[in-house]
Each structure stands twice: as structure tokens, then as C-alpha cells.
């Protein structure tokens, strides 16, 4: 029987876990596109050489991607990312990585 | 640094054309929006609009019609033009950026670099 | 006509506080925390003061402070200085226009 296999569970624990988190991150893409490129007002993140570390109060919308990406980060890496002066960092759908929150002006 | 200039006529003739451009230097428009805004002599300020670093343009409701915002990655320059003009729009006319987290919310709004202005007259 | 309303005029001594206000609607001032204040001296560009209803710019002095509560917004300056004498306009996004809208603009006097 399907269910009485050892590691079954574990099986069914890591493709539900992986769904979670298929969602999740659909959920976040929908959120980068709302906060961003439809808005005149916002700016689309860009990934730059130096980061600034500024004050930014947290509500609406960053509060709710913040615990999107808490979610996708965790249990495997800190919740900040240290001394980056960023509140997280965005991973794509091919796993790389690239800064969130974080942008300044890139200078010439 | 960041620097930027308004460039263009001092004076048009109503019914034309008023164009202008904002030269920048010390970052890229397509890493920061670029808004423009206007202040009549002795009145408030008011936005004209603004173009996002993904070239995207809004503007204020009651200039849509005669308003066009548009850049040239190129040169790094941020182009308006606002059509059918009369005295009202005389102006001195703003561009500006800002350097804040991308995270602020309708951060574009908060312009904290300033071009100098450019006083622009309609007049026959 | 401005959406945003502001007191037309202000005027303070040095080393007195004042607060600027700034009233709108549900649609602009009452939809969030977006809401910022500029700071203009006749002549001159304007010059960002706060962000975010309660984020100072870079640079600013921490006399300068702002909050929102409902539709009205506050600019407050403590230990007013004489330099602090210019003309003040809020900003906020509105949800209906998706746009930006300044206020009527305050100017304060330091008598």
C-alpha cells in the first residue's frame, strides 16, 4: 500500500512543503508586479552595487511580502539579512538571488 | 552627484507647444523615476507627472489630455511636453528625483532632488 | 483648487513650536501612510522634509516631524528657528486619480 511505505509521509510532508511554497512565491510575484511596474508613483527594484541601510516604516503591502518571504526563507536562514540595509532578499524561480528593498540611485 | 537641469524655451505663444527637458547626470533614469512638477507665479505647487525607471508614465487628471512625458535612455534624459498652452500655464517648471528605498511605497512622489526650475511664460 | 487643505498662513516665534495640518479625504491623506511634506523658501526648489507620513529625509533635522491620523496629516517644527521661515506643502497619493496631489501650502513667519 502506497501509504504504508517507509519515508511515505515524509514524501507527502516535502511535496506539500513544496507546494506551499510554489504558492508562496506566485504570491510574491503577484505582489512585486502590484507594488511596481503598474505604478507611476513606484519604482521597480533594481539590484545595485551599494546598499544603503535607511529607516522605512512597515505597513501594508511590505508588511504582507514580508511575511511572504519569511515564509520562504525559513526554517533554513536568518530573518534579516545582515548589515545589508535590506528587509529581505527576493528569490526568483530559478533560485538566484537578488536584492529587495534596498535599492539607492546607482551612481555613474 | 546627482544634478539636474530643466531645459527649453523661456517663452511660447498660446496655443503651442511647450516642450522641455530634464538633463541628468549621477544616476540613470532607468534606475530612478524622474517626476516634473509646476508652480504659477504666487500659487501652489502642482504635478504635472512622472515617469517611472520602467519607462511607465502617469499624470495629474487635469493635463492628461495635453500632457506627454517621455525618456531617452540614451541620453538620460526625461522629456515633457504639454500642448495647446495659454497664460495659465505659465509656470516655473521642475523636474526632480528621488533617492530613497525602493521599498517606500509611491516613492516616486517624494522628490528629493531638484533641478533648479526653468520659468516658462505663454505669451503672444 | 487644491484637494489638500492647508492654513494659508502661520506665524511663530523663535524657539515655539508649531504644527501644519493638512486635510484631505479617505481617497488621498486617509488611504495610508503616504503622505509627505516639502519644504519650499520663496525663489528656491522645493526641499523634502518627510516621507511616508513620519520618515525624515536625509539630512533633516529631528525638529522636523510628521504623523498622520485619519484624513489630516501634521507637519510639526519644534524650537523654531529663523530659517524655518518658508512655505510648506504636503503631498499625498490619491487612490482615486492613482496620482499624486499637493496640499494649498502654509506659509509660516518667524516672527
Known amino acids: 500500500h502506497p501509504l504504508g511505505s517507509p519515508g511515505s509521509a515524509s514524501d507527502l510532508e516535502t511535496s506539500g512543503l513544496q507546494e506551499q511554497r510554489n504558492h508562496l512565491q506566485g504570491k510574491l510575484s503577484e505582489l512585486q508586479v502590484e507594488q511596481t511596474s503598474l505604478e507611476p508613483l513606484q519604482d521597480s527594484p533594481r539590484p545595485t552595487g551599494v546598499w544603503k541601510s535607511r529607516e522605512v516604516a512597515t505597513e501594508g503591502i511590505r508588511g504582507h511580502r514580508k511575511m511572504v518571504l519569511y515564509t520562504l526563507r525559513a526554517p533554513r536562514s536568518p530573518k534579516m539579512v545582515q548589515g545589508s540595509g535590506c528587509f529581505g532578499r527576493k528569490m526568483d524561480r530559478i533560485s538566484s538571488s537578488s536584492g529587495l528593498g534596498c535599492k539607492v540611485l546607482r551612481r555613474h | 552627484q546627482v544634478r539636474m537641469q530643466e531645459l527649453g524655451p523661456s517663452l511660447v505663444k498660446p496655443s503651442q507647444t511647450l516642450s522641455l527637458t530634464c538633463t541628468v547626470s549621477?544616476?540613470?533614469?532607468?534606475?530612478?523615476?524622474v517626476g516634473w512638477v509646476r508652480q504659477a507665479p504666487g500659487k501652489a505647487l502642482e504635478w504635472l507627472g512622472i515617469?517611472?525607471?520602467?519607462?511607465?508614465?502617469g499624470y495629474n487628471p487635469a493635463l492628461k489630455t495635453r500632457l506627454s512625458i517621455t525618456r531617452d535612455t540614451s541620453k538620460n534624459q526625461v522629456s515633457l511636453s504639454l500642448s495647446s498652452v495659454t497664460t495659465e500655464d505659465t509656470a516655473v517648471y521642475y523636474c526632480?528625483?528621488?533617492?530613497?528605498?525602493?521599498?517606500?511605497?509611491?516613492?516616486?512622489?517624494?522628490?528629493?532632488?531638484w533641478g533648479p526650475g526653468r520659468m516658462v511664460t505663454v505669451s503672444s | 483648487q487644491a484637494v489638500l487643505t492647508q492654513p494659508s498662513s502661520v506665524s511663530r516665534s523663535p524657539g515655539q513650536s508649531v504644527s501644519i495640518t493638512c486635510s484631505g479625504s479617505?481617497?488621498?491623506?486617509?488611504?495610508?501612510?503616504?503622505v509627505g511634506w516639502f519644504q519650499q523658501v520663496p525663489g528656491s526648489a522645493p526641499k523634502l522634509l518627510i516621507y511616508?507620513?513620519?520618515s525624515r529625509a536625509s539630512g533633516v533635522p529631528d525638529r522636523f516631524s510628521g504623523s498622520r491620523a485619519g484624513n489630516t496629516a501634521t507637519l510639526t517644527i519644534t524650537s523654531l528657528q529663523a530659517e524655518d521661515e518658508a512655505d510648506y506643502y504636503c503631498?499625498?497619493?490619491?487612490?482615486?486619480?492613482?496620482?499624486?496631489?499637493f496640499g494649498s501650502g502654509t506659509r509660516l513667519t518667524v516672527l
Open positions: 526632480g528625483t528621488r533617492d530613497l528605498p525602493s521599498d517606500v511605497r509611491y516613492g516616486n512622489m517624494y522628490i528629493n532632488y
Open positions: 549621477g544616476f540613470s533614469v532607468t534606475n530612478s523615476g
Open positions: 515617469i517611472n525607471n520602467d519607462g511607465v508614465a
Open positions: 479617505s481617497s488621498n491623506v486617509g488611504y495610508g501612510n503616504y
Open positions: 511616508s507620513a513620519t
Open positions: 503631498v499625498s497619493y490619491d487612490s482615486s486619480s492613482k496620482f499624486g496631489v
